[in-house]
Amino acid sequence: MAVTACQGLGFVVSLIGIAGIIAATCMDQWSTQDLYNNPVTAVFNYQGLWRSCVRESSGFTECRGYFTLLGLPAMLQAVRALMIVGIVLGAIGLLVSIFALKCIRIGSMEDSAKANMTLTSGIMFIVSGLCAIAGVSVFANMLVTNFWMSTANMYTGMGGMVQTVQTRYTFGAALFVGWVAGGLTLIGGVMMCIACRGLAPEETNYKAVSYHASGHSVAYKPGGFKASTGFGSNTKNKKIYDGGARTEDEVQSYPSKHDYV
């Protein structure tokens, strides 16, 4: 039961995280105009990964896409790449994890296959989260560098007679969305990896041999220890040879209206 909960929660957390990464990537407010030195501006500038926008006090907003690819800073291109890689890995991870969920049955998929898929999706979520966090952090670092550079040459030219304040940019909402989303995806991935350990059938150092007595359906292991019957408690949560019996986890995993896929 704990394994199913961990896996399900990991999936949901990762889903929220990846949705957040997508939202952050699409958002226009990666950097917003710093109003500290000009709080009375009637024109507010903000920029995203794909376009820059200007919101006038009149309420009109004008956005212009970055229609050049080669003319863009390498750092911006790198951030775009990191975010897209994060989204792609996350999307694939989600797809894989859907089939890995214990509450979903596809044919006669073994627990070992589900465990492998859970681990794969978990790793994908971790890498996806790291990509998002890295992308956002690179952009934030770029902003900090530019902020202090523009502060150094805040008032330029005109011999100080005319004030020409250079527009400075600070952290936009998308950065915080990206950090939180990346963190959630990372946590979701870790949870999936933890769930994978509980899903994987425990390896034994000997081969199990099944002896069929005429009267009873009992499985024995070499050494005379009784492995399992169709009725006793299966404390190890392993699959038993009786096709009709289910593990503890399986018994609890009937789909209900509260299961989100």
């Epitope: 105009q33 009637a42 009149s58 004008e62 212009r64």
Partner: antibody
Framework: EFQLQQSGPELEKPGASVRISCKTS????????MNWVKQSNGESLEWIGN????????RYNQKFKGKATLTVDKSSSTAYMQLKSLTSEDSAVYYC???????????WGQGTTLTVSS | DIVMTQSPSSLTVTAGEKVTMSCKSS????????????LTWYQQKPGQPPKLLIY???TRESGVPDRFTGSGSGTDFILTISSVQAEDLAVYYC?????????FGAGTKLELK
């Protein structure tokens, strides 16, 4: 056709208050900010402040803070400006004007003449 | 507050003549974000409210004759009337639309010789 119809001329005594209205028609009232401008006896123009009819947010010229209060009535698509503690300095023509691209004012009311005299 | 200085204060011209009037701001009106200058020109005839001519320093408002041209950037702006007509006699105001409070120049009065 877009129209900004202002209330008629006002004659007030010093110390009194007055409320000037600006009724709009022909466009979405809540979609555009409304500005108020003062023009003293044919001289230059002074921006008093503006109001966002959708949210009700206001912004004032520091010079007119405490003197002017801007409000709107969305149901009648009307903007109001109340001027209090009137003095002879407040005698002027007051215009309402709609915000447009570039924060410019594209449509103006015909003006309301306020005369403050004892 | 941004101070807008217009010159000359009045201009006497003959019909058909080319006219230029200047507007200087105490601060830069160019917005880096969209490379637009937040300066507006208005025309006001006696007994009438001002009429929008040009916004963003050079964008002509629809319905405004193409003899009116706005130019300039940063702090120095010019309104040019290529061939003055009798109906152009009015006071012309420039306005800062870049930062609050929005401020107007004292105006340039265009008179006929």
């Amino acid at each position: 056709e877009f129209q900004l119809q202002q209330s008629g001329p006002e004659l007030e005594k010093p110390g009194a208050s007055v409320r000037i209205s600006c009724k709009t028609s022909g466009y979405s009232f809540t979609g555009y900010n409304m500005n108020w401008v003062k023009q003293s006896n044919g001289e230059s123009l002074e921006w008093i402040g503006n109001i966002d009819p959708y949210y009700g947010g206001t912004r004032y010229n520091q010079k007119f803070k405490g003197k002017a209060t801007l409000t709107v009535d969305k149901s009648s698509s009307t903007a109001y400006m109340q001027l209090k503690s009137l003095t002879s300095e407040d005698s002027a023509v007051y215009y309402c004007a709609r915000s447009y691209y570039g924060n410019a004012f594209d449509y103006w009311g015909q003006g309301t003449t306020l005369t403050v005299s004892s | 507050d941004i101070v807008m200085t217009q010159s000359p204060s009045s201009l006497t011209v003959t019909a058909g003549e080319k006219v230029t009037m200047s507007c200087k701001s105490s601060q830069n009106l160019l917005n880096n974000g969209n490379q637009k200058n937040y300066l507006t020109w208005y025309q006001q005839k006696p007994g009438q409210p001002p009429k929008l001519l040009i916004y963003w320093a050079s964008t002509r408002e629809s319905g405004v004759p193409d003899r009116f041209t706005g130019s300039g950037s940063g702090t120095d702006f010019i309104l040019t009337i290529s061939s003055v007509q009798a109906e152009d006699l009015a006071v012309y105001y420039c306005q800062n639309d870049y930062s609050f409070p929005f401020t107007f120049g004292a105006g340039t009065k265009l008179e006929l010789k």
